[in-house]
């Protein structure tokens, strides 16, 4: 039970177009050392949404930046949601490696559905 768990509490989240969507993720441990990444979809064709270590993700804000919640919280908020953002999002923990980090554990995924913007 001491082994790290990647917790994504919501199985599904629904948000109106134009709003921001918060996708929640937390770790139960800081070990092993390594970055967190968020992907949409699974397998070889998955799309990188956020990389804690590097990159520019203008629509993504980490929730811990907003709330200063804690260093085990890796929730993200995606702004200005459109129907194209629908899909299943995975929070993935990587173990620090050389030369490349190695995928260690994934959350169960959160399915994001997009509602029409309220009139």
């Amino acid at each position: 039970e001491d082994e790290l768990q990647v917790i994504q509490p919501e199985k599904s989240v629904s948000v109106a177009a134009g709003e921001s969507a918060t996708l929640r993720c937390a770790m139960t441990s800081l070990i092993p050392v390594g970055p967190i990444m968020w992907f949409r979809g699974a397998g070889a064709g998955r799309e990188l949404i956020y990389n804690q270590k590097e990159g520019h993700f203008p629509r993504v804000t980490t929730v811990s930046e907003l709330t200063k919640r804690n260093n085990l919280d890796f929730s993200i908020s995606i702004s200005n949601i459109t129907p194209a953002d629908a899909g299943t999002y995975y929070c993935v923990k990587f173990r620090k490696g050389s030369p490349d980090d190695v995928e260690f554990k994934s959350g169960a995924g959160t399915e994001l559905s997009v509602r029409a913007k309220p009139s």
């Epitope: 039970e1 917790i7 199985k11 139960t28």
Partner: antibody, heavy 121, light 107 residues
Amino acid sequence: QVQLVQSGAEVKKPGASVKVSCKASGYTFTSYYMHWVRQAPGQGLEWMGIINPGGGSTSYAQKFQGRVTMTRDTSTSTVYMELSSLRSEDTAVYYCAREGLYSSGWYIDVWGQGTLVTVSS
Amino acid sequence: DIQMTQSPSSVSASVGDRVTITCRASQGISSWLAWYQQKPGKAPKLLIYAASSLQSGVPSRFSGSGSGTDFTLTISSLQPEDFATYYCQQAVSHPFTFGGGTKVEIK
């Protein structure tokens, strides 16, 4: 101080809908998730779903999917829970409850006073 | 869904007694567990979060322990105001399920 004030008791007929409101005060409304939990007479607590008042995103328990709608009005710091197609088994006290900011886990730290919804023909 | 099983469903005790309530999760939830106290006609009140952390303002006679699937709430010396129903709740996965409750009654 942090307070959640809910609307008053309701009596509804089977098949009708009910909309319960919960007005928050004493904290930044958009920074804290809000849960809805119900309790049938003499029974335990049942989690219904959650809304993020910041972006308006919602997540519902499978049991209530398609029957429940949670919304918010940031101008009045109020969240709403609407339950449709009411049946007698929906007779319960409905609570809104704020999720606090904790270092490990997502826990409810403040509860509304509850709203009794009675479904009877 | 994660099932939460509480035992016993009720316990009769006297003022000053030590009372222990257990909660078992159907799968591992690390330490992501809360305990609530509810008195008749009132909303629940958070006592313990993260399995063992005491919520601000809660008397130190309440304590929690456990990790993984097995958890315990202990009241070290029962006071008259502690007669109530206690619920555990997992905070890992929606739906955030509660245990069935344990009613602490006066012997």
